[in-house]
């Protein structure tokens, strides 16, 4: 009888099925929807989380101006195809043979086409801008306290290396968190900024992906930080390819 059998759950992903039937009675966890093995010592990839979600029962200006190439996830949820390592496949198609290309965070980066559409490579999202508006408070938060708290959150809760949190901007009531991670910077074992941003997004919405942990309780010097709006912009290493028709619509 092992410790694994007493607590066979996945701390970092509640959307898993776990059983103590791994080698030596170890706990083995697989993602809902895909059945893929999940490493419970780190964040699960966004692709596997989206797939699990779709399989589950239906329930002086200091702020950054997003570049003209920034993408926002307007398409919402879809059931993605993930590769054997749990990353998004570059080309995604729906049940009606409509296909499109996505970036490494699964956001569409081309016009939709048919089965002949080619997506040569999975383009990396290297810069993520998380734009938050907090609920009214008695006064503004202290910028350096806010900065420190958000950096601590990404380091401790999401296990994202501090060097990937590029900046925290604040202009009451807007907070912007910039995450940057080039292909060359990401070492084996590093949490991906796309995965960290997705966990954060779900936490902010009160839909924590962590097993058995309470929801996110963000406080700055004891003062609750309550978010009322979230927008996330994704910047890819190669700009997206949309037709002019979409850009002028």
């Amino acid at each position: 009888h092992t410790a694994a059998q007493d607590n066979c759950t996945c701390p970092t992903n509640k959307m898993t099925v776990c059983s103590p039937d791994g080698p030596g009675g170890r706990c083995q966890c697989r993602a809902l929807g895909s059945g893929m093995a999940v490493d419970c010592s780190t964040l699960t990839s966004k692709c596997l989380l989206l797939k699990a979600r779709m399989s589950a029962p239906k329930n002086a200006r200091t702020l950054v101006r997003p570049s003209e190439h920034a993408l926002v996830d307007n398409d919402g949820l879809y059931d993605p195809d993930c590769d054997p390592e749990g990353r998004f496949k570059a080309r995604q198609c729906n049940q009606t043979s409509v296909c499109w290309c996505v970036n490494s965070v699964g956001v569409r980066r081309t016009d939709k086409g048919d089965l002949s559409l080619r997506c040569d490579e999975l383009v990396r999202t290297h810069h993520i801008l998380i734009d938050l508006r907090h609920r009214p408070t008695a006064g503004a938060f202290n910028h350096s306290d806010l900065d420190a708290e958000l950096r601590r959150l990404f380091r401790e809760r999401y296990r994202l290396h501090p060097k990937f949190v590029a900046a925290v901007h604040y202009e009451q009531p807007t907070i912007q968190i910039e995450l940057r991670q080039n292909t060359s910077q990401k070492a084996a074992g590093d949490v991906d900024i796309g995965d960290a941003a997705y966990y954060f997004e779900r936490d902010i919405k009160g839909e924590s992906l962590f097993q058995g942990r309470g929801g996110l309780d963000l406080r700055v010097r004891g003062e609750p930080l309550q978010v009322e709006r979230t927008l996330i912009y994704y910047l890819d290493e190669i700009p997206p390819k949309f037709s002019m028709k979409r850009l002028t619509a």
Epitope: A4, R26, C27, A37, V38, P84
Partner: nanobody, 121 residues
Framework: QVQLQESGGGMVQVGGSLRLSCAAS????????MSWVRQAPGKGPEWVSY????????YYPDSVKGRFTISRDNAKNTLYLQMNSLKPEDTAVYRC??????????????WGQGTQVTVSS
Amino acid sequence: QVQLQESGGGMVQVGGSLRLSCAASGFPFSSADMSWVRQAPGKGPEWVSYINADGSKTYYPDSVKGRFTISRDNAKNTLYLQMNSLKPEDTAVYRCARAKLTDTHYVEDYWGQGTQVTVSS
């Protein structure tokens, strides 16, 4: 880039034997734990053997214990699975996988494309 390439699969009669090989590259094989995982049609993946980095520790589920033997040659970056007394229920695609074992959890993080093993009666 991690690459795992299996070979040695095929069709065999009940009671027969096969030896699978897996050539590994793109990572320090001699310091990696490894597993063989199989997936039968319409079923989920199932690990069938595990070996630690230096080959001193192996594990098998009850379904294959005494029939399957996992081994490795770190000088050749190759993993092996010797399968004896094969049964129809051993029919599946067999993949080698890089694995990780902690005090409480087991996970595979990279897999090969797999080789088909068919046991006919």
